[in-house]
Amino acid sequence: MMTGTIETTGNISAKKGGSVILQCHLSSTMAQVTQVNWEQHDHSLLAIRNAELGWHIYPAFKDRVAPGPGLGLTLQSLTMNDTGEYFCTYHTYPDGTYRGRIFLEVLESSVAEHSARFQIP
């Protein structure tokens, strides 16, 4: 039985040219996280974090994606095209798969500051 929940940073905004942290957190379960997949809205892969092997960064993003903090991702040099949904998929044992969603809006305005408030989707 899957008892856990994924908490995410929810809807966030950040400045064009800046960076943002995409973060998910699995709680309320003792399941072991074996792998985390990070993907964009169109199912294109950003990165995979394997508990034993480390990080696999999709080559097209290697100059703009930094691993961490933790199981999260830092997306750098943001463009307007980065606006959209991001998904974290937690592969766990013995629970199975958990999935979280983050919506990132990239703004021209210098007012935009991203919030690190965690939400349960």
Partner: antibody, heavy 127, light 107 residues
Framework: QVQLQESGPGLVKPSQTLSLTCTVS??????????WNWIRQHPGKGLEWIGY???????YYNPSLRSRVTISVDTSKNQFSLKLNSVTAADTAVYYC???????????????????WGQGTTVTVSS | EIVLTQSPDFQSVTPKEKVAITCRAS??????LHWYQQKPDQSPKPLIK???QSFSGVPSRFSGSGSGTDFTLTINSLEAEDAATYYC?????????FGGGTKVEIK
Amino acid sequence: QVQLQESGPGLVKPSQTLSLTCTVSGGSISSVYFYWNWIRQHPGKGLEWIGYIYYSGGTYYNPSLRSRVTISVDTSKNQFSLKLNSVTAADTAVYYCARGSIAAGGGYFYYNDMDVWGQGTTVTVSS
Amino acid sequence: EIVLTQSPDFQSVTPKEKVAITCRASQSIGSSLHWYQQKPDQSPKPLIKYVSQSFSGVPSRFSGSGSGTDFTLTINSLEAEDAATYYCHQSSSLPLTFGGGTKVEIK
């Protein structure tokens, strides 16, 4: 020497679930530096990668099939399995399992070639 | 996804002739390009990994070259047993992809 052997029904009815198993012999599926793949080949066509599983359960599926695919692993039996839901005639193909190797170091890892393949099993979707 | 385009689709060659098969990637894949040989009713057999590294037991007439987006598999002095379909494969990016294949026929 590691060998892979696919098994499962050769005939599946439309809308049902295709289920195949790959048995690994001559080596452990729990080796850290390998990932385990399913690939298919439609009649007279090229190779299409379906997805992979790592021994500890991590997966990645081809986006074109992911809504219908589940790959699982049973380390106690040295096997990994493919389930493909809601099949149609377009899923008629030869299905292969294959071992891929992994390079890792410095906190990063990379996917290498697929060095060992099963003989393949033909699955026909028909009523 | 990275698209691999092989050319030609088909090649009819006389024994002892030289064969060159090209594989072009839609974006740079570095050296993460591998070649497989598939004979009728058989599973693919690994030939070359990482552009130019031959697998154990592969005859020396098979060689590979290239980098980035353009790669070539060369068969020097083709033999009758080389009649097969050849596939390139990239492991740089997920989803993993294969070229469409090049069928080599012996005249």
